[in-house]
Each structure stands twice: as C-alpha cells, then as structure tokens.
C-alpha cells in the first residue's frame, strides 16, 4: 500500500527521486570500470512525514511508534522501491567485459 | 552483496533488529484489531557506517556519495531486508476474521 503522495512539508521536500552526477573517482570505481566515465545516479532523498508514500504495514507502524517514541524509533526512511538496470564496461584480468547491474539506479521511491 | 557485519561505532550501535513493545492504542489499531492486545514489533534501527551491511550496489554508491556530499546525499538507512508474517484477529462488520500480514514484522536488516 503506497499511501499519500502529497508532501505536507512543501514541494520537493519529501521522499522522491533525485539525480546526482558522479565521476568514477567519486564512486571509487576508477580502478575497475572503464565506462561510463560519469554516472547520473538516481537515488531516493527526502523526508518521510506521517504516511507519506508508506511502503507497507511496517512503515505505518514505524510512523506511529516514531510519533510516540521519537528518541527510540526513527521515522521511516526514503529508499528505492524499485531499480533501473545499468550496464558497466568493466576491467578484468584479461581485458574488458560487459556486466549489467540490476540494483544500481533507483527507479522510484517509498518510505519504510 | 551484504558487506561487513562489524560495527565500527561499538556493539549494538549499528543497523540491527530491535524489538519495541507496542499496544493496540500505540499503533492506532484499537478500533479494528482484537488480538493480539500487544505486539512485539521487530524493527530495524541503528547507524549505517561505510559499507556496513550494504544491501546492494546502490547502497555502496550512496555511501561513497554521502562521504563526498554529506549535505546533499544522506547516509544509507537501516531498513528491513525481509519480514516475518503475523496474523491479526480483526473486527469486521459481521464479527471477526483472521488476516495474515506478510510485511509487518522485520526479520532481518540491511543498509540501503
């Protein structure tokens, strides 16, 4: 159950997909990846106020308990709900190979 | 790829399973659940330092970019890797029913 998509904190403040440009050096990949030289990393960033994009029952519980015990139970967290695959051209012992990673780029986001 | 399980912040400080006792009132369930009266909610709480229990490649990227741009990219977050099902005895219009929820109690945790 994905709950409300209305952000009470104002536009763009709640959990959503962001794109961050990163070089191979930024990612610590320069020694094992040849291409791409730069990655448009899509990731989930933003606040998870009460019931906003709640991923499941667990997220709803977490929201309730965070309201009661904010020092003990953290608020739900903005994380990927699914991923887009990406191919990397990797260095190998003998040359290069193509490797597709299914869990590299966030496709959409929810709170959990 | 689940990376290191050694917590550099000290015992129990990093992402792990915690149990929080909660009443139906705490959870906001009193009007639709009969049993259990109290739930031992297992949830994922704790810090996600570099590569600790990294769920996947995306988590590793997030760690690298958080180190570079801490104000823009948040650290990975401690969330359930899997769930334990739980049955609730629910009130219905005509009486009660049993309903199993697969996404209510965290079973184990990782950082993402």
């Amino acid at each position: 159950a994905r709950n409300g998509d209305h952000c009470p904190l104002g536009p763009g403040r709640c959990c959503r997909l962001h794109t961050v440009r990163a070089s191979l050096e930024d990612l610590g990949w320069a020694d094992w990846v040849l291409s791409p030289r730069e990655v448009q990393v899509t990731m989930c960033i933003g606040a998870c106020p009460s019931q906003f994009r709640a991923a499941n029952m667990h997220a709803q519980i977490k929201t309730s308990l965070h309201r009661l015990k904010p020092d003990t139970v953290p608020a739900p967290c903005c994380v990927p709900a699914s991923y887009n695959p990406m191919v990397l051209i990797q260095k190998t012992d003998t040359g290069v190979s193509l490797q597709t990673y299914d869990d590299l780029l966030a496709k959409d986001c929810h709170c959990i | 790829a689940r990376n290191g399980d050694h917590c550099p912040l000290g015992p129990g400080r990093c992402c792990r399973l915690h149990t929080v006792r909660a009443s139906l009132e705490d959870l906001g369930w009193a009007d639709w659940v009969l049993s259990p009266r109290e739930v031992q909610v297992t949830m994922c709480i704790g810090a996600c330092p570099s590569q600790f229990r990294a769920a996947n490649m995306h988590a590793q990227i997030k760690t690298s970019l958080h180190r570079l741009k801490p104000d823009t990219v948040p650290a990975p977050c401690c969330v359930p890797a899997s769930y334990n099902p739980m049955v609730l005895i629910q009130k219905t219009d005509t009486g009660v029913s049993l309903q199993t929820y697969d996404d209510l109690l965290a079973k184990d945790c990782h950082c993402i």
Epitope: S35, P36, P85, M86, V87, I89, T100 | -
Partner: antibody, heavy 118, light 106 residues
Framework: QVQLQESGPGLVKPSETLSLTCTFS??????????VGWIRQPPGKGLEWLAH???????RYNPALKSRLTISKDSSKSQISLKLSSVTAADTAVYYC??????????WGQGTTVTVSS | DIQMTQSPSSLSASVGDRVTITCKAS??????VAWYQQKPGQSPKALIY???YRSSGVPSRFSGSGSGTDFTLTISSLQPEDFATYYC????????FGQGTRLEIK
C-alpha cells in the same frame, strides 16, 4: 547470449526509401548504457556508422546522412528500425545492426545485403 | 569530423610473425579508440576497447596501445586464423572508422 538479426528488402529502386529492421535478444534496451546502432559496408570498402538509438531514446545520426536517416525503436518487440530515404547506387552495402554498450560496438549482427538498382 | 588513418592499408606476413598496425587520429581522441577484426564473408568482431583493453575471449597475442592521436594494434605471434581485415574506430565524437588494414598470408 546477445543476438542481432537484420532484415531488409534486398533490392531497392533509386529514389525510394530503404527500410531495415533489427530484431535483438539477450539484452534490454531499457538498461542504462545500452544502445542499438546501424553500420554499413559498401562492397569491398570500409565501415561507416549511420545512426544509433540509446536506452533513454536519444538518437544520434551521421551528420553527412542525417537528412535522409530515421531511427526508431519498438521496445515491446525488441526491434529497431532504420529508414534511409532517396537512395542511390552509392547506398548499396551490407547493413549491420550493432549492440552498443555506452560508446562501444560490442556485438554485431550478420548483416543484410541491400542493392540499389532499377 | 575526426579522420582515422590506418597504415599500412595491406600487409603480408607469415605465421609466427609479429605484426603492428597503426592508426592516426586527425585530432586528440584521448584513449577513445576501439579495434575490430573482420574475416571474409563475416561481420566485424570487437577486439579492443579504450585503446588497450581486450574484449572477452580475445587471445592475449592481441594488444593495443596509444593515446591522443597515435594508436597501434599488435599481434605478437600470428596464427592462421588471424588473417583478416582490421579496423580502428574512434568514439571521442560521433563514430568514425579507419579505412582498414588487410592482413594476408605471405
């Protein structure tokens, strides 16, 4: 494994439009970094890149031929089409469909021969 | 556009020989160069990526080097199956190929 299969008319008349189709398997064009391109080789000559289409629907064309080329994709069928308008005898060639990974022509189809003649 | 000039255009050699093919770019292309092998009646096959990295399954006798404008493909000890045409290609801007080097049995 990656497979690319070109299909075309074999013979086209001058001034007509050449339509080619590439059917591919073993990879997804929705994967970031993937693309499919077309390269041709006139008889006894070298290789010439024509066009390619990328995972994000970006299309690139050889500037010398851009006004005559159209590339498109049908992701549901794993097919790429190329149209070359106003053909002449100089367009007689083997046309290859190629899988791209980022900027690399990683895998090539067997090619389809196209002759332009009246 | 960036021109890629290969030399020689054809070359005769014997099994066991060491062979070097060169490719010169009309402007700096960094290491954005690939090499392909084409046997008669077949489609080209990827050999080298990023100037010096062998594609999967390519024997170690093939090696590439260079950066900027000058690139080489070396076959350290020719095997019978290596007689073919070789093409360099740059991908620094829109892709262009060299005219090819035909490697024949002496």
């Amino acid at each position: 494994q990656v497979q690319l299969q070109e299909s075309g008319p074999g013979l086209v008349k001058p001034s007509e439009t050449l339509s080619l189709t590439c059917t591919f398997s073993g990879f997804s064009l929705s994967t970031s970094g993937m693309g499919v391109g077309w390269i041709r080789q006139p008889p006894g000559k070298g290789l010439e890149w024509l066009a390619h289409i990328l995972w994000d629907d970006v299309k690139r064309y050889n500037p010398a031929l851009k006004s005559r080329l159209t590339i498109s994709k049908d992701s549901s069928k794993s097919q790429i089409s190329l149209k070359l308008s106003s053909v002449t005898a100089a367009d007689t060639a083997v046309y290859y469909c190629v899988q791209m990974a980022w900027d690399w022509f990683a895998y090539w189809g067997q090619g389809t021969t196209v002759t332009v003649s009246s | 556009d960036i021109q890629m000039t290969q030399s020689p255009s054809s070359l005769s050699a014997s099994v066991g020989d060491r062979v070097t093919i060169t490719c010169k770019a009309s402007q700096n292309v960094d290491t954005n160069v690939a090499w392909y092998q084409q046997k008669p009646g077949q489609s080209p096959k990827a050999l080298i990526y990023s100037a010096s990295y062998r594609s999967s399954g390519v024997p170690s006798r093939f090696s590439g080097s260079g950066s900027g404008t000058d690139f080489t493909l070396t076959i350290s000890s020719l095997q019978p199956e290596d007689f073919a045409t070789y093409y360099c290609q740059q991908y620094h801007s829109y892709p262009t190929f060299g005219q090819g080097t035909r490697l024949e049995i002496k």
